[in-house]
């Protein structure tokens, strides 16, 4: 009985996931055969959070909207260990929009989930943020310094990471 | 008031290249992205690509990869088109267009007409 | 890519008519769409963005809706001025494409 009732929660709260995820790909987590954790087939998973590559090339505001219609948002990179794990998924030769922007203009770096914003935490290549006209950061490679972030005009179409929490079943 | 003004019309021949101009005024040039159109004759309009000014960032139709190239130079406040390989079928109005801070095109030139023949 | 399909092609209408033009996106655009007015010999004119937010100084007659994949202009009472060429244009994803016209003519 007790397992026909866990069953039935899973398979109404995968039918809540099944407009925009129609396949999830799911691990069982720990020991107990009762807990799972899922990603969307086929986003990539890390610790507590799935991962999106988007490949269609998008304003920021459209990336941010692309992501939520998936019930995700653009990236919020928390630590070295995330990056270096994003990183492993992305092309040297192109650059992905973050979650993060400043809106005013005036070097008030947000996140889009309100994480505050740590000047400690982040990955800004050399030189940058450098220009209060560009304010939405990607994150993109360079050959001096490999990985890193930089300030880009919001309007200019570039690829995308979504990120969203682990569905638990 | 903002304005868009474009270079003069052009012959070309099949496989050359032509490069055509936008001169921007009445706004701060680097502060918004420039995008190309264009128009063949008694046909529709085609998305080709934009520029951002202030970094000189582009994103181009795959359709047009490898044979345009949006250039600017902050100096005179003008963005550049070019196209090479030209044929036939690129004979078209080619138009530059400011996208506004409501990412639409809000101003526009007033259109370069190319003529491909040989 | 997205495409656009814009319908009818051409239609032939009276000063003072009601006129509706459609056009249908190939996948959701999200409102991320623009209606322009071109006349011979001139660039588009921004008339409408965001699907149904008119463009500074278009008259109130120009009106747009729509959601998804399908979106409308309508012009609610033509003016001579009105008889032009329409495009609608998306910007949800590269390449922005257009769809492929309607041009309005004088009945």
């Known amino acids: 009985n007790f397992m026909y009732s866990k069953t039935v929660k899973r398979l109404s709260k995968l039918r809540e996931y099944q407009q925009y995820h129609p396949s999830l790909t799911c691990v069982m987590e720990g020991k107990d055969i009762e807990d799972w954790s899922c990603c969307p087939t086929p986003w990539t998973s890390f610790q507590s959070s799935c991962y999106f590559i988007s490949t269609g090339m998008q304003s920021w505001t459209k990336s941010q909207k692309n992501c939520s219609v998936m019930g995700a948002d653009l990236v919020v990179i928390n630590t070295r260990e995330e990056q270096d794990f994003i990183i492993q998924n992305l092309k040297r030769n192109s650059s992905y929009f973050l979650g993060l922007s400043d809106p005013g203009g005036r070097r008030h770096w947000q996140w889009v989930d309100q994480t505050p914003y740590n000047e400690n935490v982040t990955f800004w290549h050399s030189g940058e943020p450098n220009n209060l006209d560009e304010r939405c950061a990607i994150i993109n490679f360079r050959s001096s310094e490999e990985w890193g972030w930089n300030d880009i005009h919001c309007h200019v179409p570039q690829k995308s990471i979504c990120k969203m929490k682990k569905i638990y079943i | 008031q903002v304005q868009l003004v474009q270079s003069g019309a052009e012959v070309k021949k099949p496989g050359a290249s032509v490069k055509v101009s936008c001169k921007a005024s009445g706004y701060t040039f680097t502060s918004y992205i420039i995008h190309w159109v264009r128009q063949a004759p008694g046909q529709g309009l085609e998305w080709m690509g934009t520029i951002y000014p202030g970094r000189g960032d582009t994103s181009y139709n795959q359709k047009f990869k490898g044979r345009v190239t949006m250039t600017r130079d902050t100096s005179t406040s003008t963005v550049y088109m070019e196209l090479s390989s030209l044929r036939s079928e690129d004979t078209a109005v080619y138009y530059c267009a400011r996208m506004g801070d409501n990412e639409y095109f809000d101003y526009w030139g007033q259109g370069t007409l190319v003529t491909v023949s040989s | 890519d997205i495409q656009m399909t814009q319908s009818p092609s051409s239609l032939s209408a009276s000063v003072g008519d009601r006129v509706t033009i459609t056009c249908r996106a190939s996948g959701n655009i999200h409102n991320y769409l623009a209606w322009y007015q071109q006349k011979p010999g001139k660039a588009p004119k921004l008339l409408l963005y965001?699907?149904?937010t008119l463009a500074i100084g278009v008259p109130s007659r120009f009106s747009g809706s729509g959601s998804g994949t399908d979106y409308t202009l309508t012009i609610s009472s033509l003016q001579p001025e009105d008889f032009a060429t329409y495009y609608c244009?998306?910007?949800?994803?590269?390449?922005?494409?257009f769809g492929g016209g309607t041009k309005v003519e004088i009945k």
């Open positions: 965001d699907a149904e």
């Open positions: 244009q998306h910007f949800w994803s590269t390449p922005y494409t």
